[in-house]
């Protein structure tokens, strides 16, 4: 057969459906490897021709259209399952083609089993809601395309294997779920079933994301530098060790980058020929604002070292704060012997 | 212990209305979809309608759609079946059932059922 | 609407027996079907959900299990008490549909 423009498998796009419920899948050729839409090549007079492997196999077969109920159909750009079998999992590839153009791209379908209470092996979506913000939603995903704007379908939102009714502060309000006040009881793992007639079936929908409660932005401060301060005193003699701990409090933000760094003498540890190491560790509490501790170690400190400036800075989309470690070097004790001799006057 | 008590039943001619009630306790009503089902002498379950635990949706049987009205109210713990333009068809026992909150949505509860006999 | 087809209809057994009693759908309701027990002149009572799930209180004797289409209400040793009426019920849909019903009556 003649050359065909392979865009191989495309596992960034590692689709996941439930069993027993409706799947639309886009042909991803469109959507992110091609620079024109499905109209345009369809008006081009281009073919496209769906066929896929199954699991555990490498035989590349054609798709069968032809099961009872049209189980699995072609629309435009898009494969249709009504509904979704286990067995369904594998490979998918669509291709693009005429006489004289053809692309093509592979992508894994993998189709999962749901207990009753909405379990499963899933990669779940993380919805962050802002603690004590006034009201928040999340909407039921994914959904559109599915039934026409007539169908009016039923939805219920779970929280767990619950049904939300009447709970404190979160309400449904069809394909929105609605936090008046999220609080950190809020986190888990919120499910709507969407159920929709077709053809005189009934089908669900069911997507299920996981709530994560964070430090709200009306509360973000800058970081926070709680070591090295000013109470604290590193006194060494040379050939000690010297640990120096950075510890850095930052508040959740949104897609904020957090870093800690130390500077000796105004440059990076990287940049200077001292034995330097530096050890890093990150907490989190339960709004996910963070804490970082980055221990800088002289295993053997010289008296050179102790005149040096360590300085501990800190960044994050709220600002930046430095703080200067207090190094100083021991001075040694006098020796006992001579201090009582000169305290009494010896000679 | 949860409690459903049906009450409302008797004899009514075709074409007339009739209204059931069931009243609840033992526990929080307003958190629970409530059903009604039916039993003609001698047959099987039917099921008749249900009302979320807050009356925003309402489904029926279309044997009833149009006819039978679920309504709740909250503040009484009672649970509605408004019957209207009843047929000969309709003489069964009427039970309420809770629906326990899960996916699955089982009837966990039933009250005894009270008799609605539709003759002229 | 979902059509739920039991059978049998009617099964006479003896005590001690292990009996099955099936539902089939006329289409796929995954999980999202209960079995009850009804004893003349009395409310049905709920025995199992979801397929398989056993409700508080009930023997083990009693099981579930199939999805899709196809259920299966089992008793591993039948008592005395177990004689009644047995239906499916299916959830999947706004509108619930019960099974006809299956009569276990002593041989």
């Known amino acids: 057969s003649e050359r065909c423009d392979d865009w191989g498998l495309d596992t960034m796009r590692q689709i996941q459906v439930f069993e027993d419920e409706p799947a639309r899948i886009k042909c991803p050729l469109f959507e992110h490897f091609l620079k024109f839409n499905y109209s345009t090549a369809h008006s081009a007079g281009l073919t496209l021709i769906w066929y896929w492997t199954r699991q555990d196999r490498d035989l590349e077969e054609p798709i069968n259209f032809r099961l009872p109920e049209n189980r699995i159909s072609k629309e435009k750009d898009v494969l249709w399952f009504r509904p979704t079998l286990l067995n369904d999992t594998g490979n998918y590839t669509c291709m693009l083609r005429n006489t004289t153009y053809c692309s093509k791209v592979a992508f894994p379908l993998e189709v999962v089993q749901k207990d009753s209470c909405f379990n499963s092996p899933m990669k779940l979506p993380v919805h962050k809601l802002y603690i004590e913000y006034g009201i928040q939603r999340i909407t039921c995903p994914n959904v559109d395309g599915y039934f026409p704007s007539s169908v009016k379908p039923t939805i219920t939102w779970y929280m767990g294997c619950y049904k939300i009714q009447n709970f404190n502060n979160v309400i449904p309000e069809g394909m929105n779920l609605s936090f008046l006040i999220a609080l950190i009881s809020n986190n888990g793992n919120y499910t709507c079933v969407v159920t929709y007639p077709e053809n005189g079936r009934t089908f669900h929908l069911t997507r299920t994301l996981t709530v994560k409660v964070v430090g709200s932005p009306k509360n973000a401060v800058p970081p926070v530098i709680h070591s090295p301060n000013d109470h604290v005193v590193y006194e060494k003699e040379p050939g000690e060790e010297l640990l120096i701990p950075c510890t850095v409090y930052f508040s959740f933000l949104m897609d904020s980058r957090n870093e800690v760094w130390w500077t000796i003498d105004g440059k990076k540890p990287d940049d200077i020929t001292i034995d330097v190491t530096i050890n890093e560790s990150i907490s989190h509490s339960r709004t996910e604002d963070e804490t970082r501790t980055q221990i800088l170690s002289i295993k053997k400190v010289t008296s050179e070292d102790l005149k040096r400036s360590y300085v501990c800075h800190a960044r994050s989309a709220k600002g930046e704060v430095a703080k200067a470690a207090k190094v100083k070097q021991k001075v040694p004790a006098p020796r006992y012997t001579v201090e009582l001799a000169c305290g009494f006057g010896a000679t | 212990q949860v409690q459903l008590v049906e009450s409302g039943g008797g004899v009514v001619q075709p074409g007339r209305s009739l209204r059931l009630s069931c009243a609840a306790s033992?526990?929080?009503?307003?958190?629970?979809?409530m059903h009604w089902v039916r039993q003609a002498p001698g047959k099987g379950l039917e099921w008749v309608a249900v009302i979320w635990y807050d009356g925003s949706n309402k489904f029926y049987a279309d044997s009833v759609k149009g006819r039978f009205t679920i309504s709740r109210d909250n503040s009484k713990n009672t649970l509605y079946l408004q019957m209207n333009s009843l047929r000969v068809e309709d003489t069964a026992v009427y039970y309420c059932?809770?629906?326990?909150?899960?996916?699955?949505?089982?009837?966990?509860?039933w009250g005894q059922g009270t008799l609605v006999t539709v003759s002229s | 609407d979902i059509q739920m087809t039991q059978s049998p209809s009617s099964l006479s057994a003896s005590v001690g027996d292990r009996v099955a009693i099936t539902c089939r759908a006329n289409?796929?309701?995954?999980?999202?079907l209960n079995w009850y027990q009804q004893k003349p002149g009395k409310a049905p009572k709920l025995l199992i959900y979801g397929a398989s799930s056993l409700q508080n209180g009930v023997p083990s004797r009693f099981s579930g299990s199939g999805s899709r289409t196809d259920f299966t209400l089992t008793i591993s040793s039948l008592q005395p008490e177990d004689f009644a009426t047995y239906y499916c019920q299916q959830s999947y849909s706004t509108e619930i549909t019960f099974g006809q019903g299956t009569r276990l009556e002593i041989k």
């Open positions: 289409q796929s309701i995954a999980s999202y």
């Open positions: 033992g526990f929080t009503f307003r958190n629970y979809g």
């Open positions: 059932a809770r629906e326990e909150g899960i996916a699955v949505a089982p009837f966990d509860y």
